[in-house]
């Protein structure tokens, strides 16, 4: 089957959600690990990740269609320490498949705002930190 990984971001007030979505077939979930890395150009692994999610096969989902699994990493307040390059990755212990998403970046600016770049064009986000709104 076709397995892929996408990255996205959303904001709720001061919170920034970084989301790694893996699309896969139901039977491929077992043994899959999804993880998010920061500033790891070559050695992104579950061990060096900020967060990881081990997928489980859900017997409640019928059919053999494609399903998605999400890892959500929530930052309550973006600070200058969050500036850097992020990447969503996944790997399967069973099949040996490794997936690497596009790199995306958080840039904290001198004005106290931050931007998230490198996502799909519609997901290029600019956030005003103090108001917590999309600008």
């Amino acid at each position: 089957g076709c397995i892929n990984i996408t990255s996205s971001a959303s904001q709720e007030g001061t919170r920034l959600n970084l989301i790694c979505t893996v699309w896969h077939k139901k039977e491929e979930a077992e043994g899959f690990v999804v993880f998010l890395c920061k500033d790891r150009s070559g050695d992104c692994s579950p061990e060096t990740s900020l967060k990881q999610l081990r997928l489980k096969r859900d017997p409640g989902i019928d059919g053999v269609g494609e399903i998605s699994s999400q890892l959500m990493f929530t930052i309550s307040q973006v600070t200058p320490l969050h500036s850097g390059t992020y990447q969503c990755c996944a790997r399967s212990q069973k099949s040996g498949i490794r997936l690497q998403g596009h790199f995306f970046s958080i840039l904290f600016t001198e004005t106290g705002n931050y931007t998230v770049t490198g996502l799909k064009q519609r997901q290029h986000l600019e956030f005003s930190h103090n108001e917590g709104t999309l600008s």
Partner: antibody, heavy 119, light 107 residues
Framework: EVKLVESGGGLVQPGRSLKLSCAAS????????MAWVRQAPTKGLEWVAS????????YYRDSVKGRFTISRDNTKNTQYLQMDSLRSEDTATYYC????????????WGQGVMVTVSS | EIVLTQSPTTMTASPGEKVTITCRAS?????MHWYQQKPGASPKPWIY???KLASGVPDRFSGSGSGTSYSLTFNNMEAEDAATYYC??????????FGAGTKLELK
């Protein structure tokens, strides 16, 4: 078990230098931003400096800017605080702490090391 | 720089008593964290993001607040709760600031 062990404190004269170390274990050190927080005798807590996971970005409180340098060696799981031009008001217990990545709380703290600046 | 003012500075409470410590910020902040520190020990995270209990903290503790006013409450004082409590926030560009602390003693 997360462990942070500070060393390098002691008595030093005003204007002199001292270098503190913090040896970390029990977690993937290179993934975490780190900080130094100090506490003057019988006083409250005061953030001193922070460093990002890769060591390329550093941040300081105004009163130590230009005098203190925070650094880290991810191959040795250790962070440092180089303190130059020390003043009597720098006398404090210095704590090594980890930054929680999802929040702005300091989630693990070392036992602290005493620095006394006096002639 | 945002200044955090804790009150009271010192207080005494009897076992079983309800205790409330407040922290006022000089400007509005998004979250408040609280730490417990006992003599000769390093601070421990106690409550984070205003109302979430840190690992191992008894559920008699609670945190609340918004804007410039935050509080730490425990429903029935126990001997082990005697300590100094500090509030802390983050904002840009002053970064991390702490309150001066509230020393809680057992009556």
């Amino acid at each position: 078990e997360v462990k942070l062990v500070e060393s390098g404190g002691g008595l030093v004269q005003p204007g002199r230098s001292l270098k503190l170390s913090c040896a970390a274990s029990g977690f993937t050190f290179s993934t975490y931003a780190m900080a130094w927080v100090r506490q003057a005798p019988t006083k409250g807590l005061e953030w001193v400096a922070s460093i990002n996971s890769g060591g390329g970005d550093t941040y300081y409180r105004d009163s130590v800017k230009g005098r203190f340098t925070i650094s880290r060696d991810n191959t040795k799981n250790t962070q440092y605080l180089q303190m130059d031009s020390l003043r009597s008001e720098d006398t404090a217990t210095y704590y090594c702490a980890t930054h929680n990545y999802e929040s702005t709380v300091f989630d693990y703290w070392g036992q602290g090391v005493m620095v006394t600046v006096s002639s | 720089e945002i200044v955090l003012t804790q009150s009271p500075t010192t207080m005494t409470a009897s076992p079983g008593e309800k205790v409330t410590i407040t922290c006022r910020a000089s400007s509005s902040v998004s979250y408040m964290h609280w730490y417990q520190q006992k003599p000769g020990a390093s601070p421990k995270p106690w409550i984070y993001e205003t109302s979430k209990l840190a690992s191992g903290v008894p559920d008699r503790f609670s945190g609340s607040g918004s804007g410039t006013s935050y509080s730490l409450t425990f429903n029935n004082m126990e001997a082990e709760d005697a300590a100094t409590y500090y509030c802390q926030q983050w904002n840009y560009p002053s970064m991390y600031t702490f309150g001066a602390g509230t020393k809680l003693e057992l009556k």
